[in-house]
Structure formats: C-alpha cells, structure tokens
Interface confidence: low
C-alpha cells in the first residue's frame, strides 16, 4: 500500500493511472466504502463524504488515463486509505495528515521557552526532528521543548516528520525578542557628549510598550531611574526623566539617549528593560559608561578614569612622539615635573587604544592649556 | 513534482555582476529552501548558498560579500545575483530546492552556463 | 569548512557486477542530539543534472531503485550498488549538511568497462 504524508492545511494530490490512456470511469472511495468522487463520462461527480467541498480532480488528465483525487486544506481527521477503483482494479493510498504548531506565539522574549506540538493521526507513530537556524538539532515525539532561546534561534525552524521512512517538512518562523547586544561600552572624555543607543534585533508591524534606564554611579551606594518612556507603534514619548542628568531621548526607534557630558559622576553601569503589551517578562540590555579626565596640579600631571574598566586595560601617560612616561594597570596615573610639551592619556587594551585625552603642559611659568 | 528553469545572461564581462533568476514551477515558492549550486567546466559541485521566503539566507563564506539572494513569490522566481566576477566564476549554474527532505537538494534546473569572458 | 574525499576517483563497472563508492568527511556529521547523520549521495548522469539518490546516510530518495543503498558512520561511509545497470553511469557526489557552507566530494565517475 503506498503511503502519502500531508501537512495539515496544505493540498495533497493522491494518484491513481489507468493502464488504457484515456477517460474512462473511475471512483475514488474512503476506506468505509464511501465515495468521494468519481466521474459520469466528462462530469466529475461527488458522493457524500466529509471531504465534499474540499476534494476534486483533473479532468485535464482524464485523457491521459489518470484520475487523481484532490484533497485541499487538509485536516488531520483526513488521515485514511482511499481507493481508487479504476478498470476492475483497486489502488489503494494511505494518506496520513500531520500538523505541527508552536506553543502560544511565535514571537518569544530571549531566554523564554519554544513548544512545537506535533498533530497526528491516530495509529501513527511519528518522530520529529528539528532544526534551528543556528543548526542546533532536537529530536522528540509529540512536543519538542527548547528552553532558553538565544537570539541566534530567531529564523526559520525546520522540522522533518518521519513517518513509514517517508518525510514530511513544516517550516515555522521563529522571532526572538531581544536587543541586538547584550552588552555595550562607551568610553568619553570629561565634557563630551555621550550617544547611547539600544538597537532591537526584530522588526514587527506595531510595537508597543513600556521601558526604563535604571543607572549605578561608580560614586553612587545605589542606583536610581534616570529616565522612562513609553512606546506606541514605533514612536517613544518620555515619561518621566532626572533633572541631573537630564537625559533627552530620539522620538523614533532605535532607542537613543544622550547624555549632554561625560562627567566623572556618571560613569558606571545601566540597564535598560523594555516591558512589551502583551509579552510577559523584559527585554534588557546592559550598557557602560568609562570617563577619562587628565589635569594638570602644580607640578603634578594626572589621568584618571572612572567607570567599569576590566583590570587588564592599561592606563599609560606619555609625552606625544614618546615612549610612556608611566604605564599601569590601575584607575589613576601621574607624573610629576612633566617637561613641556603634548602629552596624552592613553587608556588601552591590547594595545588597542580605547580612549585618549590630551593636555598641553607649558614651560613652568605658564598655565597648562587643554586642548 | 516541483520542475525549475534557470535563466540569465550566458556571457557576462569581468568585474560586472552574474545576474540569475530560477523559475519554479509545480509548487509554491513559499513551502521550500531555494539553493544556488554551481560547478565549473569539468569540476566537482559548490554551494553558493540558500534562501527561505522569510528572507533569512545562508551563504558560503568564499562568496559571502559577493553574493545577493532574493525571490519575488509574486512571480514564484527566486533570484542570485554575484558581483565582480572574475574568469574563475565561469560554471554552469544550478537552482536546487530541498522538497521536504531537510536539508537535502532533490530537484534540480537542468543548469545554465555563465561564462565570463571580455 | 568540513573537507569531502572520495575513493575511487574513477570506477570501471561491470553490468551486472556490485559496486561499491567511498565517501570521508574531515568531522563527523553526526549530530549528537538527534543521532541522524548528515550525508546525501547524488548521482550527475551525463549532460544532466545532478540527481539525489540518498539522503541522511541511508533513506532512498522517491523513485531510486533499491539496489543503491548508503551505509557508514562518523566520517566513513559508503554507497553500494547491488548490480550495477548501464544506467547508472555518471559522476557521484557525497555532500554533508550538518553545518554550514554545505559542502561536496571531488566525484566518483563510474563508467562501464
């Protein structure tokens, strides 16, 4: 008996061939004996099964000595052996109808969990198995459970039904919610203006919500709501924001602030959570701030930086064009008796310059000038 | 059964960009993943890289900064494009589609050769 | 990039005579999650397409004859033909689907003695 698997909601086209090639009678019947259709010369008939309004046939083919039978928006409760009586032959098609569907929606927050649920018809006895967009592969029976998703398991799953060594695919577009970075760092001198900005990494019709910027000072014992807004389709409205600082925010995604200067008491960490209309739980990111400031006291030169440095950056001041004066791995560095001349805060990783302050040191009678 | 017919310019100039487009027939061009293959005169089969109606695409990293894929379901056509190509980018060109078996390619266009020549 | 080998490169047939392609691959394409192997033979019959014969190691594609069939595990396997038909010449072709880029064997041109 040859067996055809289907999707639920699909089309399926059973075959049945005639060794004649041309029209002659036909019916196809379900496995209670019921017709579904057949043909009256060149007349497609109907019997009276549940499929009435969703089977049909080529009569295109007819000529040629096939007679196939049409099945549309195919139901699992489809799953049956339908005969094809033809030439005093019997063929017989076992069709099985699978459906497979995803727990609740399909767009999930990062870290919630995915269940696709798999449709069968009873006897049958299916495996699944699917495949992420990050190629991460789980097998199951009825429901498949991947917990924890990762913003790399936004995309299409594929998943392959197994059935009598024949396969079946259903694709599923999966969006995880999430911002496209987890974590982000900006470093600034005293008194530059600072850009954050938090980028999602889908894209939907409407979005709407609610968020925050909750931020820790280095300096500070606690942390504190530096501003909330909230979101309708796309458009962000502040609602609620410090006088210090005080933040100004884009009135379009992505979501920007900036921050008017870089000052040593605003270095530290933040994390923005965005709270979307019916999504439980948050979206977050974190974000850092590190602040350089290279000054000048009498005869002492110093750089300092505040803010989350890992402690293999390295601090260093040199004169420009030289080699450095004092390197180290600590938040303050300082030279006293400078000779004259440009002299540079480097902050570095690697060797990789991440931030860099520049002070002009005049001959001793003269004042320091910052460019 | 699902048929595909590759066309295209079978001549194209160096440092131009390969322009090809696959037309599927007997299925529709949202159920599948939608391949490029491609094998020089002679020579053994590469993969350029892949494309699903959702927009997300899989390429080869030896062409990744080359190579644009993209499908009109409109037209059930789907379509490769690679730009600055040079004398080794001459092959006959394959469009493939999975047909429900996972990853695996099982129909094939019958190919079209692209020659890049001045 | 996960590198294919094949042996022979060349293969004289006899009609009617067993034949037998081997496939390696350079990491395993088992994936340990799901305990399927990730290999497809194609077979490119002269001036045509190349052809899927079997898929995930083992299962035969709609309409190949049963006298192929795909064996193997981990990075070795093999692609038997029980008796070889004058048909069945062409180049064949090992390709994994396991990660990505999606990569081929060099072929195994089989031809009749």
């Known amino acids: 008996k040859k067996v055809v698997l289907g999707k639920k909601g699909d089309t399926v086209e059973l075959t049945c061939t005639a060794s004649q090639k041309k029209s002659i009678q036909f019916h196809w019947k379900n496995s209670n004996q019921i017709k579904i259709l057949g043909n009256q010369g060149s007349f497609l008939t109907k019997g009276p099964s549940k499929l009435n309004d969703r089977a049909d046939s080529r009569r295109s083919l007819w000529d040629q000595g096939n007679f196939p039978l049409i099945i549309k928006n195919l139901k699992i409760e489809d799953s049956d052996t339908y005969i094809c009586e033809v030439e005093d032959q019997k063929e017989e098609v076992q069709l099985l109808v699978f459906g497979l569907t995803a727990n609740s929606d399909t767009h999930l927050l990062q870290g919630q969990s995915l269940t696709l649920t798999l449709e069968s018809p009873p006897g049958s006895s299916p495996s699944v198995q699917c495949r992420s967009p990050r190629g991460k592969n789980i097998q199951g029976g009825k429901t498949l459970s991947v917990s924890q998703l990762e913003l790399q398991d936004s995309g299409t799953w594929t998943c392959t039904v197994l059935q009598n060594q024949k396969k079946v695919e259903f694709k599923i577009d999966i969006v995880v919610l999430a911002f496209q970075k987890a974590s982000s760092i900006v470093y600034k001198k005293e008194g530059e203006q600072v850009e954050f900005s938090f980028p999602l990494a889908f894209t939907v019709e409407k979005l709407t919500g609610s968020g925050e910027l909750w931020w820790q000072a280095e300096r500070a014992s606690s942390s504190k709501s530096w501003i909330t807004f909230d979101l309708k389709n796309k458009e962000v409205s502040v609602k609620r924001v410090t006088q210090d600082p005080k933040l100004q925010m884009g009135k379009k995604l992505p979501l920007h602030l900036t921050l008017p200067q870089a000052l040593p008491q605003y270095a530290g960490s933040g994390n923005l959570t965005l709270a979307l209309e019916a999504k439980t739980g948050k979206l977050h990111q974190e974000v850092n701030l590190v602040v350089m400031r290279a000054t000048q006291l009498q005869k002492n030169l110093t750089c300092e930086v505040w803010g989350p440095t890992s402690p293999k950056l390295m601090l260093s001041l040199k004169l420009e064009n030289k080699e450095a004066k004092v390197s180290k791995r600590e938040k303050a560095v300082w030279v006293l008796n400078p000779e004259a001349g440009m002299w540079q805060c480097l902050l570095s990783d690697s060797g990789q310059v991440l931030l860099e302050s520049n002070i002009k040191v005049l001959p001793t009678w003269s004042t320091p000038v910052q460019p | 059964q699902v048929q595909l017919q590759e066309s295209g310019p079978g001549l194209v100039k160096p440092s131009e960009t390969l322009s090809l487009t696959c037309t599927v027939s007997?299925?529709?061009?949202?159920?599948?993943?939608w391949s490029w293959i491609r094998q020089p005169a002679g020579k053994g089969l590469e993969w350029i890289g892949r494309?699903?109606?959702?927009?997300?695409?899989n390429y080869n990293p030896s062409l990744k900064s080359r190579v644009t894929m993209s499908f009109d379901t409109s037209k059930n056509q789907f379509s490769l494009k690679l730009n600055s190509v040079t004398a080794a980018d001459t092959a006959v060109y394959y469009c493939?589609?999975?047909?429900?078996?996972?990853?695996?390619?099982?129909?094939w266009g019958q190919g079209t050769l692209v020659t890049v020549s001045s | 990039d996960i590198v294919m080998t094949q042996t022979p490169l060349s293969l004289p047939v006899t009609p009617g005579e067993p034949a037998s392609i081997s496939c390696r691959s350079s990491?395993?394409?088992?994936?340990?999650?799901?305990?399927?192997?990730?290999l497809d033979w194609y077979l490119q019959k002269p001036g045509q397409s190349p052809q899927l014969l079997i898929y995930?190691?083992?299962y035969r594609a709609s309409g190949v004859p049963d006298r192929f069939s795909g064996s193997g595990s981990g990075t070795d396997f093999t692609l038997k033909i029980s008796r070889v038909e004058a048909e069945d010449v062409g180049v064949y072709y090992c390709?994994?689907?396991?990660?990505?880029?999606?990569?081929f064997g060099p072929g195994t041109k089989v031809d009749i003695k």
């Open positions: 493939a589609t999975d047909g429900g078996v996972g990853d695996s390619l099982d129909y």
């Open positions: 007997g299925g529709s061009i949202g159920s599948y993943y």
């Open positions: 494309i699903y109606t959702s927009g997300s695409t």
């Open positions: 990491q395993s394409l088992l994936d340990s999650d799901d305990g399927n192997t990730y």
């Open positions: 995930t190691l083992s």
């Open positions: 390709m994994q689907h396991i990660e990505f880029p999606f990569t």
